[in-house]
């Protein structure tokens, strides 16, 4: 899997999208997990609704939300009030039984707030030693979802 980089500004919201094949993953719940080390486990942060038909309902764990457009095949994760410690490697997953398929590997980078005049030196950025040769950057512009943007699945 290539790694997609999403950059957000500290204190703002970052929206991460993970596209997938809606037919292949039909009926499957999804999850957002944080990679603990390069070879370590992926620790679950938040997962979609227990009832797959209600996957469109936004589920929160702390400042992280997840919602799934099961018809269009897009999983959306929102990291609210982004903080330096949110930077790191994550995965979007499709769950089946006790197994999990990786939909997308995501590197979250936290940029200093340009309006914040404090020393930006305490912001953590992924080190040069981490190799993401295949990574491509998606600049995610922070904004609130407009009414009607939350997608819905079919129900029968």
């Amino acid at each position: 899997h290539n790694t997609t980089v999403f950059q957000g500004v500290a204190g703002q919201s970052l929206q991460v999208s993970c596209p997938y094949d809606s037919m292949k993953h039909w009926g499957r719940r999804k999850a957002w997990c944080r990679q603990l080390g390069e070879k370590g486990p992926c620790q679950r942060v938040v997962s979609t609704h227990n009832l797959w038909l209600l996957s469109f309902l936004r589920r929160w764990n702390g400042s992280t939300a997840i919602t799934d457009d099961t018809l269009g095949g897009t999983l959306t994760i929102t990291l609210r009030n982004l903080q330096p410690h949110d930077a790191g490697l994550y995965q979007c997953q499709s769950l089946h039984g006790s197994e999990a398929d990786t939909l997308r590997k995501v590197l979250v980078e936290v940029l200093a707030d340009p309006l914040d005049h404090r020393d930006a030196g305490d912001l953590w950025f992924p080190g040069e030693s981490e190799s993401f040769e295949d990574a491509h950057v998606e600049h995610s512009i922070s904004r609130s979802l407009l009414e009607g943007e939350i997608p819905f699945p079919p129900t029968s």
Epitope: H49, L51, L54, F56, L57, W60, G148, F152, P154, T155
Partner: antibody, heavy 118, light 107 residues
């Protein structure tokens, strides 16, 4: 601001059908789930079923399966709940509710009183 | 189906007092529980979702807690407008179900 406006009160005979409407304004109608909940006089709330307008398909509580039909007309941003083979115990206030973000019941219509009496 | 049992059925309190309402599920609903307030002649209003998150515009005196089978809605200091019926609701399993309600009345 999301608003749900329901049709007026109905008086029906046992064995007949009733169709209650719920017109939505604010936001994109096709992107929201609409549910129907009823409340008999002095009683609690009972989920009947719901629809995702973009797909036009509905989910029903087993208790109402075969007797209730929930539909939506995107062109008029209106959802409908039709209940057939009415009996006196169907006398209740029928509410439509719409998801906005968090639950299936983020915002509610004002309710429609349906009285079943011979 | 999951049965939600609310207790007490009626709670008689005075303005300014603390109200503690209970909702017990017949089996685990994880954190998939919401609380609604309903006043006479009105539609219900969402107060709490996901067991502990306040809905937009809901005053801080309302708080929810619990997970699994036992949940609590707390109103820290009752205001005159808080006297109403409160319902819990789960959507962890089909069908979606509501509790029987707790009426909070003025003592």
């Amino acid at each position: 601001q999301v608003q749900l406006v329901q049709s007026g009160a109905e008086v029906k005979k046992p064995g007949s059908s009733v169709k209650v409407s719920c017109k939505a304004s604010g936001g994109t109608f096709s992107s929201y789930a609409i549910s129907w909940v009823r409340q008999a006089p002095g009683q609690g709330l009972e989920w009947m079923g719901g629809i995702i307008p973009i797909s036009g398909t509905a989910n029903y509580a087993q208790k109402f399966q075969g007797r209730v039909t929930i539909t939506a007309d995107e062109s008029t941003s209106t959802a409908y709940m039709e209940l057939s083979s009415l009996r006196s115990e169907d006398t209740a206030v029928y509410y439509c509710a719409r998801t906005q973000e968090y639950t299936l019941f983020d915002s509610w219509g004002q309710g429609t009183m349906v009285t079943v009496s011979s | 189906e999951i049965v939600l049992t609310q207790s007490p059925a009626t709670l008689s309190l005075s303005p300014g007092e603390r109200a503690t309402l209970s909702c017990r599920a017949s089996q685990s609903v994880s954190s998939y529980l919401a609380w609604f307030q309903q006043k006479p002649g009105q539609a219900p209003r969402l107060l709490i979702y996901d067991a502990s998150n306040r809905a937009t515009g809901i005053p801080a005196r309302f708080s929810g807690s619990g997970s699994g089978t036992d949940f609590t809605l707390t109103i820290s200091s009752l205001e005159p407008e808080d006297f109403a019926v409160y319902y819990c609701q789960q959507d962890y399993h089909w069908p979606i179900t509501f509790g029987g309600g707790t009426k909070v009345e003025i003592k």
